[in-house]
């Protein structure tokens, strides 16, 4: 069984190489009883969803940028 069906994770795998300009918003889900791993779920400007690798330096920068833009709004 995949991680997603073994726990209640939403990310079966992570998408590599996404351009920040294609991202509308990012949600970071902390680990919990439903899922043992941190999940980074991006909503793309085309409405689709993508799971990103939380350990990736690029993803960390995207999250930081999104959080900072939220604070300034």
């Amino acid at each position: 069984a995949s991680v997603a069906t073994e726990l209640r994770c939403q990310c079966l795998q992570t998408l590599q190489g996404i351009h920040p300009k294609n991202i509308q918003s990012v949600n970071v889900k902390s680990p919990g009883p439903h899922c043992a791993q941190t999940e980074v779920i991006a909503t793309l400007k085309n409405g689709r969803k993508a799971c990103l690798n939380p350990a990736s330096p690029i993803v960390k920068k995207i999250i930081e940028k999104m959080l900072n833009s939220d604070k300034s709004n």
């Epitope: 069906t5 009883p33 969803k49």
Partner: antibody
Framework: EVQLLESGGGLVQPGGSLRLSCAAS????????MSWVRQAPGKGLEWVSA????????YYASSVKGRFTISRDNSKNTLYLQMNSLRAEDTAVYYC??????????????????WGQGTPVTVSS | DIQMTQSPSSLSASVGDRVTITCRAS??????LHWYQQKPGKAPKLLIY???NLESGVPSRFSGSGSGTDFTLTINSLQPEDFATYYC?????????FGQGTKLEIK
């Protein structure tokens, strides 16, 4: 056709036990999480329990934890709910539901997209 | 546990009306919210998944919106078959929780 069929409901005395079954057909049962949801007479929906595709992970509402056990037999395409130490407040129609929802290759959502017809459980002396 | 609060609890409307049902979560749940319709004596039916996506086979007069803590189900041009009870449900974390329901009745 995707179908879920519950059985095993009935009248039981307080403190008694009952085992509900849910027979699944029309989809690859072992790939999907399943849930039990109940509805007391004239009341809203209450989630009871969920189980992962392999059966390795289980989840319970606090109201049933320690009394109810969810399990599945993937070789028989069947979901179970063992209910012990039943109380009057457990009286309800019990539904099993499939949790479908692979949207993208890398993103999964958990929506109860297929439901059984429900089986009534009455706890009364 | 995440509490889900629906409003109103009941609603009277006429065929052809546009109605809105709201659902509020006690904490942010992103868009991890579904809407169900239930008719008396029947099992619930999935209408909207992930806050705004129409389930296959559901008429386009149903729509959902919202993110975070506030969500809305809208039915445009009510049809006789739409009179039912509607529930929201979060799956952001376990335990899964439903709203208390909104009963839509014919005026």
């Amino acid at each position: 056709e995707v179908q879920l069929l519950e059985s095993g409901g009935g009248l039981v005395q307080p403190g008694g036990s009952l085992r509900l079954s849910c027979a699944a057909s029309g989809f690859t049962f072992s790939e999907l999480s399943m849930s039990w949801v109940r509805q007391a007479p004239g009341k809203g929906l209450e989630w009871v329990s969920a189980i992962s595709g392999s059966g390795g992970s289980t989840y319970y509402a606090s109201s049933v934890k320690g009394r109810f056990t969810i399990s599945r037999d993937n070789s028989k395409n069947t979901l179970y709910l063992q209910m012990n130490s039943l109380r009057a407040e457990d009286t309800a129609v019990y539904y099993c539901a499939r949790e479908g929802g692979r949207l993208e290759p890398y993103y999964y959502y958990y929506a109860m997209d297929v439901w059984g017809q429900g089986t009534p459980v009455t706890v009364s002396s | 546990d995440i509490q889900m609060t629906q409003s109103p609890s009941s609603l009277s409307a006429s065929v052809g009306d546009r109605v809105t049902i709201t659902c509020r979560a006690s904490q942010s749940i992103s868009d991890n919210l579904h809407w169900y319709q239930q008719k008396p004596g029947k099992a619930p039916k999935l209408l909207i998944y992930d806050a705004s996506n129409l389930e296959s086979g559901v008429p386009s007069r149903f729509s959902g919106s919202g993110s975070g803590t506030d969500f809305t189900l809208t039915i445009n041009s009510l049809q006789p078959e739409d009179f039912a009870t509607y529930y929201c449900q979060q799956y952001y974390s376990t335990p899964l929780t439903f709203g208390q329901g909104t009963k839509l009745e014919i005026k």
